[in-house]
Structures are given as C-alpha cells and as structure tokens.
C-alpha cells in the first residue's frame, strides 16, 4: 500500500515538473511573441510614416509618369548592371515608346552628357532577335541602329538620342527602372 502511494506521489511530482516546464515554455513563448509584436508594430509604423512622407520615387531617382529611373554613377558590364538594378528592386530600363525614349535622352543630356548607358535589351545568339528582359519584342522604331560585329553576346545601350548595340562585356553606365509609388492622398 505504501509503495503504491509513493508511486502515485512520484507520478504527481513528475506531472507537476512537466506542467512547470510547459508554463515556463509558454511564458517564454509569450514574451517572444510580445517582442515580435513590438518589433512588427515599430516596423509597420516606420513603413507607414516613411510611405506617408515619401515621394513616388526614391531619392536620386527621376520620375516620369508611372516610372522611376535611376542613372548609375558607376560603370559595369551588362550582367552586373542587371544585378545592381535587382538589388534596388528594379530592372534595367525597358523603353516602351518614343515618348519614353525622348524623356530618357533629354534627362541624360541634363545629367551627364553624351555617355553610354546599358538598357534591358539583348540579342538572342541563335535567332539574332532583339528582346527586352521580360521576353517582349521592342517596337520597330526602338531597335538598335547598328548591328555589333562582336562574336560575344550583344546588348543594347543608349547614347545621346540613339539606341545602339555592343558586346555585353564592355563597361558602361546603366539605367534602372521601377514603378512609381501611387500616392494614396
């Protein structure tokens, strides 16, 4: 009988230890949740206040209609230019119209003068077709003027008010593009 009672007592004690452990875990979990909640609230508050105060484009980007453009201050090869744009949540410039081309070339004249700027245009090695980075074809008026004699991959760039082509491994400035933020006010 005594043995039975002590076994029950031991079982109860074990149960108590498990409950204490569970309570400790729960308290820890609750504390962690509270911290995460605090962090999330702070982050959202920051995001909201910066969104409220921000312009449609980030600092040092130029806006035209629904687009924001970034004109690089460094040179890089075409593939690295593409990655640099991705880091900013953008892609290499995709020119959709003559109006956009005119805006870009006009802006470049004001900013930097006559330099070379990579855009998101490349030539398929097999077919020789020019394609934008999303796979779409450029409109007839927006095809590079000269066909590069390079045996390597060929990419498109803007210079003055022309669209030209060059070996993708040459170093040039580049232009990134992303959507402008819509103002909710």
């Amino acid at each position: 009988k005594l043995l039975q009672v002590s076994t029950i007592a031991m079982q109860q004690q074990e149960k108590l230890i498990q409950q204490e452990r569970a309570l400790l875990n729960f308290t820890e979990w609750k504390r962690s949740c509270a911290l995460q909640m605090k962090y999330c609230q702070a982050f959202m508050q920051n995001s909201l206040s910066s969104a409220h105060n921000s312009s449609p484009c980030p600092n040092n980007w130029i806006q035209n209609r629904e687009s924001c453009y970034y004109v690089s201050e460094i040179w890089s090869i075409w593939h690295t230019s593409q990655e640099n744009c991705l880091k900013e949540g953008s892609t290499l410039l995709q020119i959709e119209s003559k109006e956009e081309m005119d805006f870009i070339t006009g802006s470049l004249r004001k900013i930097k003068g006559s330099y070379d700027y990579w855009v998101g245009l490349s030539q398929d090695g097999h077919s020789g077709r020019w394609l934008w980075q999303d796979g779409s074809s450029p409109s007839p008026g927006l095809l590079p003027a000269e066909r590069s004699q390079s045996a390597n991959q060929v990419c498109g760039y803007v210079k003055s008010n022309s669209l030209l082509s060059s070996n993708c491994s040459t170093w040039k400035y580049f232009i990134c593009e992303k959507y402008a933020l819509r103002s909710s006010v």
Partner: nanobody
Amino acid sequence: QVQLQESGGGLVQPGGSLRLSCAASGRVFSINAMGWYRQAPGKQRELVAAITNQGATTYADSVKGRFTISRDTAGNTVYLQMNSLRPEDTAVHYCKAFTRTDDYWGQGTQVTVSS
C-alpha cells in the same frame, strides 16, 4: 539574415517540364528581388530569371519563351516553371535573394535533363 529553401529539382526527359520553388524566411521584408541562377559543371553561375518585389521580370536569352518566373501573393516564395527542357538546361539551380546591402543564396537543387 534571409534563409532560402529550394525544392522541385529532379530528372526529366528532353521536352519535359519541372517547377522549382524557393521559400524565403527570416528578414524577408528586406528583399527587393528574387532570382534563379544555374551552374553547370565547369561553367560559371549564370542568372536564369528574376522577379522584383513589384513583379517586374527578367530572363536570360536562352530561356525566354520556355521558362516563367512567378511568386506567391505574400511574395515570400518564388517559382520557376521550366518547360521544353533541353539537355543544356542540366545544372544545379540556385535561388538568390537580392537586398540593397547583401545577397543570399540557397543550397541549390539539381536539374538533370536526359533521356
């Protein structure tokens, strides 16, 4: 830190399809774009496709019209739908997250196209 977990690789016959997935966790709010790269034996790692947090896409010339990159509504998982696969698509495919200051890589998933 951002952690990336790829899945969906495997062995497929030429002309077949595969869908790769890459799930991001950790500081996902810092990600500006996500992309897929591949590396074939003895070759350099190359960008296959990428998608920005605004949904703009970019593709390597060799996959245009065959591969499609997309993401879920939360933006934390990126998919690469690979159709009309060719033997030259055989490579380890890696997921990459782009932030303003850092790049994060997944462990990679093997894609083998062979009959």
